[in-house]
């Protein structure tokens, strides 16, 4: 018994005069805007996006929207076309949804915010945006009160008219419409494809948060990793950083390239490498390989407990007004607009701390 290193877990609620607001990362579930896909993009990435077959032809499809099909048929006419160099990172950057077009309104603690307050970040969903990233020398925003008026409220247009037609199942095309959101500490990168939650158009979604500070013990009392990150890519250790680090190594090892969202200096995967290696390899790692990416718990971490609720938007009463305000049809408003409210429930944080049972 003397050699048993027991621990106890202490729970505490700590009142605070202010709390650091978390980073909020959001991604449109559609990775590439239809209007931004050029003839050269289609030539290089058409098969990856299931828009072309392996003979550079539009596949036989009864599912196509006539207008979209007409545009694609014109772009897919490669007679006398000379392909230009193509880079997946540049494609994601140029063709991904632009926060300046999506963001219809933004308020933090009642004050107006704008697209400039969102930093571009690449994830497996492509071009995404983080509010309050705390990077580029910007201070981390604070909040002094709990409740909806003291957090972030944004209205977004998800731009479904720009969604790529889905004529096949690929990792780069989505059956869903909306955004994915992750609320996370500024000390860890987003891992939104695995840890994000979905927000649907046609709803105002309220996310009530509670900050939780977790303190774990290292061996032999617990299993946390007390060492600083052994990584070329991240400054501080987190499970997310470790997993991204590991996924990058796995892809470079299997495919000799990295996905657009992965750090490092390996070459970016080509569309062919995405299709033939990177997508299936990463799917295998995430779904099947239980051993390659074993990431230890850090000794200190901040997470955010969340409670979600939703109401319909627009109401019958406001549909006409919003349609006029944004110069869109009522149907467009119903299919594309969402409001997201993220706030602290109360101005306190919870500590969950492992302590040695006896010294």
């Amino acid at each position: 018994y003397y050699f048993c290193y027991h621990h106890v877990t202490k729970l505490d609620e700590v009142a605070a005069s202010q709390l650091t607001f978390p980073a909020v990362t959001l991604c449109n579930l559609n990775e590439f805007r239809f209007s931004q896909v050029s003839k050269n993009d289609l030539y290089h990435a058409g098969e990856l996006l299931a828009l072309l077959n392996n003979r550079y032809e539009i596949p036989d499809t009864q599912m196509a929207d006539e207008k979209q099909l007409e545009i694609l048929q014109d772009k897919a006419n490669f007679r006398s076309f000379k392909p230009k160099p193509f880079n997946m990172r540049e494609f994601y950057d140029r063709a991904g949804h632009d926060i300046r077009d999506m963001l219809l309104s933004c308020h933090f603690r009642g004050e107006a915010c704008s697209a400039e307050d969102f930093k571009v970040v690449f994830t497996r969903y492509g071009k995404c945006y983080t509010f309050n990233s705390g990077q580029d020398g910007r201070p981390r925003l604070k909040t002094m009160k709990g409740g909806t008026g003291n957090g972030l409220e944004i209205m977004l247009d998800i731009q479904q008219d720009e969604y790529l037609p889905v004529w096949g199942e690929t990792d780069e095309t989505s059956f869903e419409a909306g955004i994915k959101v992750q609320i996370h500490s500024q000390d860890e990168p987003p891992f939104i494809d695995q840890l994000g939650f979905g927000v649907a158009p046609g709803f105002q979604t309220f996310v009530s948060c509670q900050e939780q500070r977790l303190i774990y013990l290292p061996s032999p009392w617990g299993t946390c990793n007390a060492v600083t990150m052994d990584s070329d890519f991240f400054d501080s250790y987190s499970i997310t950083a470790c997993r991204i680090d590991c996924e990058t190594r796995y892809l470079v090892e299997n495919c000799n390239c990295r996905m657009v969202h992965m750090p490092g200096d390996a070459p970016y995967c080509t569309p062919e490498q995405y299709k033939e290696c990177a997508d299936p390899a990463l799917d295998f790692l995430v779904e099947k390989d239980q051993e390659y990416c074993v990431c230890e718990m850090p000794c200190n971490l901040t997470r955010y407990g969340k409670e979600l609720s939703m109401v319909k938007i627009p109401s019958k009463a406001s549909a006409k007004y919003l349609a006029k305000k944004f110069n869109k049809s009522e149907q467009y408003i119903g299919e594309n607009i969402l409001v997201l409210d993220i706030f602290f429930e109360v101005l306190n944080y919870e500590t969950i701390e492992q302590k040695k049972a006896y010294e």
Epitope: N254, A281, D283, F284, K288, D289, Q290, E291, Y292
Partner: antibody, heavy 116, light 107 residues
Framework: EVQLLASGGGLVQPGGSLRLSCAAS????????MSWVRQAPGKGLEWVSG????????YYADSVKGRFTISRDNSKNTLYLQMNSLRAEDTAAYYC?????????WGQGTLVTVSS | DIQMTQSPSTLSASVGDRVTITCRAS??????LAWYQQKPGKAPKLLIY???NLESGVPSRFSGSGSGTEFTLTISSLQPDDFATYYC?????????FGQGTKLEIK
């Protein structure tokens, strides 16, 4: 180039033992799970056993459980299959394969014949 | 264990024919299915992985489709070199299992 080279097959009497080896090259051996697959003469493919990259987890087909032991030496980039209490129905070509999002490559196979 | 049922077990066809081989899993295996071609005395050759991905160097007349429990391998226009035995394999979960094989022979 990623390569697997299976060896150690031969003729053995029923009840006897044999140890197969599979030498790997061209990839980080310890990062990948590995499997043995066999094929009896004129028959189909049968998965025999698998092992995780570290060697911590092992898996067996019911037909060989308790008789065969899979192991690996990551310092030597080698996979092993220790076969005990061999039976006539274990006669087959044994292939080693690298497990991942695709099972590629396979070794060329080593023939095990169990006969008196 | 997951059972893989392949059909037909024998298939007679002529050069230029379009042929389809099906594989049914006893429970969902997502897309973790591979197709192999094997010729007598040789190791299996990977054709398709993750249900629909064509292995590098494999002619484009081979294609795979399906997910969940139903999968197909299609050869769009049979060539003389394609007469062989074909196997499907699930690698979704241990114990990994193969179909019983489809022997493709000249009509």
């Amino acid at each position: 180039e990623v390569q697997l080279l299976a060896s150690g097959g031969g003729l053995v009497q029923p009840g006897g033992s044999l140890r197969l080896s599979c030498a790997a090259s061209g990839f980080t051996f310890s990062s990948f799970a590995m499997s043995w697959v066999r094929q009896a003469p004129g028959k189909g493919l049968e998965w025999v056993s698998g092992i995780s990259g570290s060697g911590v987890s092992t898996y067996y087909a019911d037909s060989v459980k308790g008789r065969f032991t899979i192991s690996r030496d990551n310092s030597k980039n080698t996979l092993y299959l220790q076969m005990n209490s061999l039976r006539a129905e274990d006669t087959a070509a044994y292939y080693c394969a690298k497990e991942a999002y695709k099972w590629q490559p396979w070794g060329q196979g080593t023939l095990v014949t169990v006969s008196s | 264990d997951i059972q893989m049922t392949q059909s037909p077990s024998t298939l007679s066809a002529s050069v230029g024919d379009r042929v389809t081989i099906t594989c049914r899993a006893s429970q969902s295996i997502s897309s973790w299915l591979a197709w192999y071609q094997q010729k007598p005395g040789k190791a299996p050759k990977l054709l398709i992985y993750k249900a629909s991905n064509l292995e590098s160097g494999v002619p484009s007349r081979f294609s795979g489709s399906g997910s969940g429990t139903e999968f197909t391998l299609t050869i769009s226009s049979l060539q003389p070199d394609d007469f062989a035995t074909y196997y499907c394999q699930q690698y979704n979960s241990y114990s990994y299992t193969f179909g019983q094989g489809t022997k493709l022979e000249i009509k």
